[in-house]
């Protein structure tokens, strides 16, 4: 109810003589702070005095502390929350009830805590899971209802008296809810741990033994078996007898059933600890074991490999690989069931014994076409010789052999002809399925292995064919030797190296890139007129009149080819200059007179210079000189000079006459 003080602490604390006790404690007073605290041992209420009687272990008041046993007993609390206590060392006669007498300004309370002190250190308690199975990890717990800051302890695990290798995790609790020390050990027990003793040992800080708890492990496990065989090496011949015995070395719980297995499969009607095999056959060779079950599951013995020996069976040949490519390596393997394994082999190729081949494998590093055929073998062991089996076929594949390209046409071949070629070969495995031709072209293949080139080009120099099965074999190229008219005929200026000026010595060359046949003739023409029949056309001193369009022709026995027209340009200084006058050479004053300097020049005149009758230059550089308004004083002889990059040329004098106007005459 609301008139109670509220306390929290463990109900009972445990310790032993000479150890210590630590009492975690919290409280809440009804009003105000704590003013007086007395710790009683076994307090009893005295009705007469209305006070508690008993041994006072600790006392604390407003006035100060009463010494009593203050050194052994310590109040570690405060005036409003904490009431933690420590007794160090603790004695056997401290057992009983501790009474915490609390007084505030107006309220009082007696809180009781049980203390159990034993003469000797009490043992810890081992906790095991309800069931332990082999190889399944379990946690072993060792719990001790004791912990005190002033008295360190340790818990150690032992198996059959030997410290356990596994690391244990130790934890302590000193709270108002619980006081304990706990050690937890994770452990995967094996079947061999069954019945073994596990100990949790309590030790002081120095490792001195204080107490312990022990448990016997009950490890559930499948039956553990041993198998015995007669004869002991388990090697027999067909017709012999064999006995196998199964012994149980351990089982928890007890076993329930027995069975025998061969190569992992259960043998029917074999449910005893002895297996008798009479007059064994080679089919009974294999791996035998016994299986015994209990509630945990089945347990199996180790396997016994029973070998029933027999002479080799008829052999077969395995080829790695067929078909084989010529030049590759091939391995033949003779396969024959036998026990013991064959020690000697005889090999046959197309029924004929292969000398010096006595191994299980025959290796041919470089296969040739003649290696093709049937391969068979015979195996032999200590019990006899097997029979020769049907054998295996080796197919040797190779590219087409001796491929040739053959021209079917009569020679010589001319540009534009239709050429037929055939592709021939000697032998092939597998058969030829297609043909290839080099170079590629938009050519016809009227039938397999035949190529038709319509309108053969001048530059179709060589053709090669390939006959193809899985591979292509190329023939040596065959020369078509196509004859054609001269090609790429052009006019080339040999001299001068720069532009042609009037008066230069000029040489033109008629070039062509190729001709077949090589023998050629040349022709030069200008404007349809034949000029020469040499490869060069020469001018000792070129004149502007030689300028024009030139062509050359080259012919051989196949035909003739013309060059593109080539323009011969002759550069010359301005010539044939003359001054023309507009509207004429007689002009009335006040009007406009235009003088034009006419000329012939290559390149054209870049600028002109105008001169009067006193050879004085006028400030004009254009072709026309405009005088406006013209004056009578302008009458006189004028001339012009034209300039281009080659040089200068001058005109003769032209006279301009400026006459008076009627107005001027009228004024005189």
């Amino acid at each position: 109810d609301s008139s109670k003080w509220v306390f929290e602490h463990p109900e009972t604390l445990y310790a032993w003589e000479g150890a210590c006790v630590w009492i975690p404690c919290t409280y809440r007073a009804l009003d105000g702070d704590l003013e007086s605290f007395i710790l009683f041992h076994n307090p009893e209420y005295n009705k007469n005095t209305s006070k508690f009687d008993g041994t006072r272990l600790y006392e604390s008041t407003k006035d100060g502390k009463v010494p009593s046993e203050q050194k052994r007993v310590q109040f570690l609390g405060d005036k409003n929350k904490n009431c933690t206590l420590s007794i160090h060392p603790v004695h056997l006669n401290d057992s009983g009830q501790l009474g915490l007498r609390m007084e505030s300004k107006t309220e009082k309370w007696m809180e009781r805590i049980h203390l159990n002190v034993s003469e000797r250190p009490f043992p810890p308690h081992i906790q095991l899971p309800p069931e332990i199975q082999e190889s399944q990890e379990v946690t072993l717990t060792c719990l001790l209802n004791f912990s005190c800051y002033g008295y360190p302890i340790q818990l150690q695990w032992l198996l059959e008296g030997v410290p356990m290798r596994q690391a244990a995790v130790t934890s302590t609790s000193l709270t108002i809810k619980s006081v304990f020390t706990r050690s937890e050990l994770k452990f995967s027990p094996q079947w061999s741990h069954h019945g073994k003793i596990v100990t949790c040992q309590l030790q002081d800080a120095d490792g001195k033994f204080l107490s312990n708890d022990t448990v016997q492990l009950n490890v559930k496990h499948t039956p553990k078996l041993e198998i015995k065989v007669t004869p002991s090496d388990a090697i027999v011949r067909e017709g012999d007898s064999v006995t196998m015995t199964c012994e149980v070395s351990s089982s928890n719980p007890e076993y329930t059933t027995v069975s025998w297995l061969k190569d992992g499969t259960s043998l029917k009607k074999q449910n005893t600890f002895t297996l008798n095999l009479r007059e064994v056959t080679k089919d009974q060779s294999g791996k035998y074991c016994c299986q015994v079950s209990n509630d945990v599951g089945p347990g199996r013995s180790e396997e016994v490999f029973l070998q029933v020996q027999y002479a080799p069976e008829p052999s077969t040949v395995q080829i790695l690989h067929s078909p084989a490519v010529e030049g590759s390596q091939v391995e033949f393997l003779c396969m024959s069931l036998a026990n013991p394994l064959p020690t000697n082999y005889t090999w046959y190729h197309n029924g004929k014994e292969m000398q010096g081949r006595t191994e299980e494998k025959v290796h041919i590093p470089k296969i040739l076409p003649w290696h093709a055929g049937t391969y068979s073998c015979v195996a032999e062991n200590i019990l006899g010789t097997g029979q020769r089996g049907p054998g295996a076929e080796l197919d040797v594949q190779y590219p087409p052999k001796k491929v040739t390209t053959v021209i079917q046409n009569p020679m010589p071949i001319r540009e534009g002809d239709t050429v037929t070629l055939s592709c021939n070969y000697n032998s092939s495995n597998p058969s030829v399925t297609r043909y290839e031709w080099k170079p590629h072209g938009a050519w016809e293949e009227p039938s397999l292995g035949v190529l038709k080139i319509q309108n053969v080009g001048w530059d179709n120099t060589t053709i090669a064919c390939a006959a193809c099965n899985s591979w292509c074999s190329w023939a040596s190229p065959v020369a078509l030797n196509v004859q054609y008219a001269p090609r790429d005929v052009r006019v080339r200026k040999i001299k001068p190296l720069s532009e042609i000026h009037s008066g230069n010595s000029v040489s033109l060359q008629c070039d062509f890139s190729s001709s077949h046949p090589k023998e050629v003739q040349f022709f030069w023409e200008k404007n349809g007129r034949l000029l020469g029949k040499e490869s060069q056309l020469n001018f000792d001193s070129i004149s502007p009149e030689d300028a024009g369009s030139y062509s050359c022709w080259v012919n051989n026995s196949i035909g003739q080819t013309a060059s593109k027209a080539w323009t011969l340009e002759v550069l010359y200084a301005p010539r044939r200059l003359r001054v023309s006058m507009s509207p004429g050479d007689q002009v009335m004053e006040g009007k406009s007179a235009t003088l034009t300097c006419e000329s012939d020049a290559n390149p054209p005149v870049s600028h002109y210079t105008w001169f009067d009758w006193n050879n004085q230059s006028l400030p004009y550089h254009s072709q026309k000189l405009r005088l406006e308004p013209v004056k009578v004083q302008h009458s006189g002889a004028y001339w012009c000079q034209g300039t281009n990059s080659v040089g200068k040329g001058r005109s003769p004098l032209s006279t301009l006459t400026v006459y008076y106007s009627p107005e001027t005459i009228g004024r005189r």
Partner: antibody, heavy 118, light 107 residues
Framework: QVQLQQSGPGLVEPSQTLSLTCAIS??????????WNWIRQSPSRGLEWLGR?????????DYAGSVKSRITINPDTSKNQFSLQLNSVTPEDTAVYYC?????????WGQGTMVTVS | DIVMTQSPSSLSASVGDRVTITCRAS??????LNWYQQKPGKAPKLLIY???NLETGVPSRFSGSGSGTDFTFTITSLQPEDFATYYC?????????FGGGTKVEIK
């Protein structure tokens, strides 16, 4: 060194005649290796050549087509100067007027006269 | 009349920069092209005559090239006093004509 000194009114009334004179020092108006030019400059038309006079064996004149009907350039050998007359002026003739000597390019220029037609 | 087209009409540059101006004639004028510099309130000043000849007293950082219809004017390393307007002019035939000018301003 050659110098050109311009003179003439800065304000001319529309339809009147604009008259400017360019006095030459350090060269002769009758030199037979040069030409004497008039150029004007306005924001709307930039640099505009108006005409020139030059002496070779006689006197010659060249005029720009835009002013041909209104312009006269005369040399005055006695005063070693040359003049510009531009008739029937309009506000479009407002500009800075320059005289210049042309030998190889216009290498000597007058100081310029700002003429306003208003 | 021969039309002279100058480009660009204006450009911004810094002291030390290389500046190039082009001038194109509407027909061939051989090498009869002159270049002028004009500063505000002053008369034009001849820099280059006959396309590539440097006028007496003009610094060598100014140069010109070209013939026919296409011409170039270059200032190799712009100086503070070079900020001005530049004009080309043909003297091939009358009427003599000028380009529209290129104003070189400080960046």
């Amino acid at each position: 060194q050659v110098q050109l000194q311009q003179s003439g009114p800065g304000l001319v009334e529309p339809s009147q005649t604009l008259s400017l004179t360019c006095a030459i020092s350090g060269d002769s108006v009758s030199s037979d290796s040069v030409a004497w030019n008039w150029i004007r400059q306005s924001p709307s038309r930039g640099l505009e050549w108006l005409g020139r006079t030059y002496y070779r064996s006689t006197w010659y004149n060249d005029y720009a087509g835009s002013v041909k009907s209104r312009i006269t350039i005369n040399p005055d050998t006695s005063k070693n100067q040359f003049s510009l007359q531009l008739n029937s002026v309009t506000p479009e003739d407002t500009a800075v007027y320059y005289c210049a000597r042309d030998r190889n390019g216009m290498d000597v220029w007058g100081q310029g006269t700002m003429v306003t037609v208003s | 009349d021969i039309v002279m087209t100058q480009s660009p009409s204006s450009l911004s540059a810094s002291v030390g920069d290389r500046v190039t101006i082009t001038c194109r004639a509407s027909q061939s004028i051989s090498s009869y092209l002159n270049w002028y510099q004009q500063k505000p309130g002053k008369a034009p000043k001849l820099l280059i005559y006959d396309a590539s000849n440097l006028e007496t007293g003009v610094p060598s950082r100014f140069s010109g090239s070209g013939s026919g219809t296409d011409f170039t004017f270059t200032i190799t390393s712009l100086q503070p006093e070079d900020f001005a307007t530049y004009y080309c002019q043909q003297s091939y035939t009358t009427p003599l004509t000028f380009g529209g000018g290129t104003k070189v301003e400080i960046k």
